[in-house]
């Protein structure tokens, strides 16, 4: 099976050849096609956890409930100035973050 950060090149023989996700995409593995990262900033939310080649970003509301302590808010939104992600026209162009080199190959 294709591991995290990679996707099958051939849907008929999943796990035989696995290529890394393209930039800005992620795959949790298990032969899943790469999907675009969510852009928390453009969804009007904080980025609680940045996306990686193997997982999507985790977002949280900018204004947590009044009862929630201030220090539990997420970090400031990252300075991204792009629009929200949309479905990929290719069946699966997929991701990787800047410091990460995505291994290809099989799990």
């Amino acid at each position: 099976r294709c591991r995290a950060g990679t996707q099958p090149l051939d849907s008929y023989k999943p796990g035989v050849d696995c290529a890394p996700c393209p930039p800005g995409h992620f795959s949790p593995g298990d032969n899943q096609a790469c999907k675009p990262w969510t852009n928390c900033t453009l969804a009007g939310k904080h980025t609680l956890q940045p996306a990686s080649n193997s997982s999507d970003a985790i977002c949280e509301d900018r204004d947590p409930p009044a009862t929630q302590p201030q220090e539990t808010q997420g970090p400031p939104a990252r300075p991204i100035t792009v629009q929200p992600t949309e479905a990929w026209p290719r069946t699966s162009q997929g991701p990787s973050t800047r410091p990460v080199e995505v291994p290809g190959g099989r799990a």
């Epitope: 996707q7 099958p8 090149l9 051939d10 035989v16 050849d17 696995c18 290529a19 890394p20 393209p22 930039p23 800005g24 995409h25 096609a33 790469c34 675009p36 990262w37 969510t38 852009n39 996306a51 991204i80 100035t81 792009v82 629009q83 929200p84 992600t85 949309e86 990929w88 026209p89 290719r90 069946t91 699966s92 162009q93 997929g94 991701p95 990787s96 973050t97 800047r98 080199e101 995505v102 291994p103 290809g104 190959g105």
Partner: antibody
Framework: QVQLVQSGAEVKKPGSSVKVSCKAS????????MHWVRQAPGQGLEWIGG????????TYNQNFKDRATLTVDKSTSTAYMELSSLRSEDTAVYYC??????????????WGQGTTVTVSS | DIQMTQSPSSLSASVGDRVTITCKAS??????VAWYQQKPGKAPKLLIY???TRHTGVPDRFSGGGSGTDFTLTISSLQPEDFATYYC?????????FGGGTKVEIK
């Protein structure tokens, strides 16, 4: 038709930076990953990295990770590649190249015309 | 990094000849190989992806083959416009890497 038009030739001093642009037309810019590849004189092709305009996510060749910065301006359908701390061995033709439209294959189906960067003191 | 070694580095041939270029990967890359043609002073052009699939508009005299570590690009009947340099590229793993090129010259 689908086209990538790059900025003109540059002559730079060692230690300086260069920023090359690549303006896309004929397709939906944000939906295709844009990559950068360079070719030193008389040499082969070397992949620098790529960026997905829709969310700004980028992937770099580790050989360039600390010196190359890829950005996009979606309002003008333009991709940029900035290379810092230039040295003579960075003298090359720099190409932008769009990733193709056939499934998850990481190949390049449309290329810019190339930008010659000369690093010389 | 995966090394892609092409051979020969150059060859001389005549119009009408059958020409075969080989590319050897330093490790198994499945079928994740593309081939490009480049003419002097011009950008490369995609010919083949997925080892053997011709890109749109590429003449059927160009064919690709192989899997694993050994790949070939064959031009069944060389035409005047085919004199150029040819490169293979692997995309099973980052960084994406290219072969050193094979220059096809007129005999």
């Amino acid at each position: 038709q689908v086209q990538l038009v790059q900025s003109g030739a540059e002559v730079k001093k060692p230690g300086s930076s260069v920023k090359v642009s690549c303006k896309a037309s004929g397709y939906t810019f944000k939906d295709y990953t844009m990559h950068w590849v360079r070719q030193a004189p008389g040499q082969g092709l070397e992949w620098i990295g790529g960026i997905y305009p829709n969310n700004g996510g980028s992937t770099y060749n580790q050989n360039f990770k600390d010196r190359a910065t890829l950005t996009v301006d979606k309002s003008t359908s333009t991709a940029y590649m900035e290379l810092s701390s230039l040295r003579s061995e960075d003298t090359a033709v720099y190409y932008c190249a769009r990733m193709g439209y056939h499934g998850p294959h990481l190949d390049f189906d449309v290329w810019g015309q190339g930008t010659t960067v000369t690093v010389s003191s | 990094d995966i090394q892609m070694t092409q051979s020969p580095s150059s060859l001389s041939a005549s119009v009408g000849d059958r020409v075969t270029i080989t590319c050897k990967a330093s490790q198994d890359v499945g079928a994740a190989v593309a081939w490009y043609q480049q003419k002097p002073g011009k950008a490369p052009k995609l010919l083949i992806y997925w080892a053997s699939t011709r890109h749109t508009g590429v003449p059927d005299r160009f064919s690709g083959g192989g899997s694993g570590t050994d790949f070939t690009l064959t031009i069944s009947s060389l035409q005047p416009e085919d004199f150029a340099t040819y490169y293979c590229q692997q995309y099973i793993n980052y960084p994406l890497t290219f072969g050193g090129g094979t220059k096809v010259e007129i005999k």
